[in-house]
């Protein structure tokens, strides 16, 4: 039984892999930052997380997903205010009972740090120094991203 | 209430480089892009640039090569420098909050009052 | 660089009028993002219209946008004494940002 969380994160991931290819996005649009090899897109308005991971959608990208603690902390760096927290792309998984990511994959328990409970209805959130385990009904700003990439790709749920 | 000044020299003599300061009063600088427009007398709206909080930068091609925008986090204060003026640059520079793509609203929300700036010897 | 071209230049209106401001792009303009603008001699820009459509905090319910790719419109429903100013819209889907050349709406 999938939570309605879950769906509304398959349904988005479904409806984003229907294009089969894409031009490479060789440089950052406006308003996006370089960090890497991926394009940021940080909010300054709050919503939940399933309208996080919709609002990325429809701008052709997907919260955050963030590969290792060194991506993290890259990221963190960006994050000038201590207090601001963030949706990225994770969220607890009721029937595997395991944080998965929304491109489909588990987490690695060596990547993220988590304060907080692993529960029905938690998603994740970083701010500047941490990150947390937070209701997905919170109202927070989340981070969206584009892959950078200099060729033709196909388009995978994680790009 | 978020505000925004202007604050500079309203007199810049050909060749040299013209100054502007804009003061963010009553918010954070944070997560918005803080932009700098022009208008020459009885004309349009040209925009110069942004400044993103992280010190990340876009200027608009015509005036990149004399455009440097810069921000001080501490001060809540982003700068205006272009350089090499002539008569041609001599406008009403506006500093403006723009709430990018992301946000209850987009676009230049909040704008300075503006300052004339005349270039002549 | 997306060139935004205003039509008509001047708009001679009364009061109680409706106003339609014509706004095309050489290219279309990403996910509608499109502002209109406001100004009055002497002053700033105020902002009225963001995402093609969508009224800025404050702005009476007179005022409306709509329009997507290349195509947008500003509309005046009524005209108040208030309304005769310059108006200009702007994308900000594309680098560089860019204006139209404006529409002035006076009183005929």
């Known amino acids: 039984q999938k939570s309605s969380i879950e769906k509304c994160s398959v349904d988005i991931q479904q409806s984003r892999n229907k294009t089969t290819e894409r031009p490479g996005l060789l440089n950052c649009p406006i308003y996006w930052q370089q960090l890497r090899e991926k394009c940021l897109l940080f909010s300054h308005t709050v919503n939940p997380w399933n309208n996080s991971l919709a609002d990325c959608s429809t701008k052709e990208s997907s919260l955050l997903l963030i590969r290792d603690k060194d991506e993290l902390i890259h990221t963190q760096n960006l994050i000038r205010d201590k207090a601001i927290l963030f949706w990225i792309g994770l969220n607890f998984s009721l029937s595997e009972k395991n944080w998965k990511w929304i491109n489909g994959s588990f987490l690695n328990s060596n990547d993220l740090e988590i304060r907080g409970d692993a529960k029905e209805n938690s998603c994740i959130s970083i701010s500047q120094t941490s990150v947390y385990s937070e209701y997905c009904s919170t109202e927070i700003r989340w981070i969206c991203q584009k892959e950078l990439t200099p060729v033709r790709n196909k388009v995978y749920p994680d790009s | 209430q978020v505000q925004l000044q202007e604050s500079g020299p309203g007199l810049v003599k050909p060749s040299e480089t013209l100054s502007l300061s804009c003061t963010v009063s009553g918010g954070s600088i944070s997560f918005y892009y803080w932009t700098w427009i022009r208008q020459p007398p009885g004309k349009g709206l040209e925009w110069i640039g942004y400044i993103y909080h992280s010190g990340s930068t876009n200027y608009n091609p015509s005036l990149k090569s004399r455009v440097t925008i810069s921000v001080d986090t501490s001060k809540n204060q982003f700068s205006l420098k272009l350089s090499s003026v002539t008569a041609a640059d001599t406008a009403v520079y506006y500093c403006?909050?723009?709430?990018?793509?992301?946000?209850?609203?987009?676009?230049?929300?909040?704008w300075g009052q503006g300052t004339m700036v005349t270039v002549s010897s | 660089e997306i060139v935004l071209t205003q039509s008509p230049g001047t708009l001679s209106l009364s009061p109680g009028e409706r106003a339609t401001l014509s706004c095309r792009a050489s290219q279309s303009v990403t996910s509608s993002y499109l502002a209109w603008y406001q100004q009055k001699p002497g002053q700033a820009p105020r902002l009225l219209i963001y995402g093609a459509s969508s009224r800025a905090t404050g702005i009476p319910d007179r005022f409306s946008g709509s329009g997507s790719g290349t195509d947008f419109t500003l509309t005046i429903s009524r005209l108040e004494p208030e309304d005769f100013a310059v108006y200009y819209c702007q994308q900000y889907g594309s680098s560089p940002l860019t204006f139209g050349g404006g529409t002035k709406v006076e009183i005929k």
């Open positions: 403006a909050r723009d709430g990018g793509i992301v946000g209850a609203t987009n676009a230049f929300d909040i």
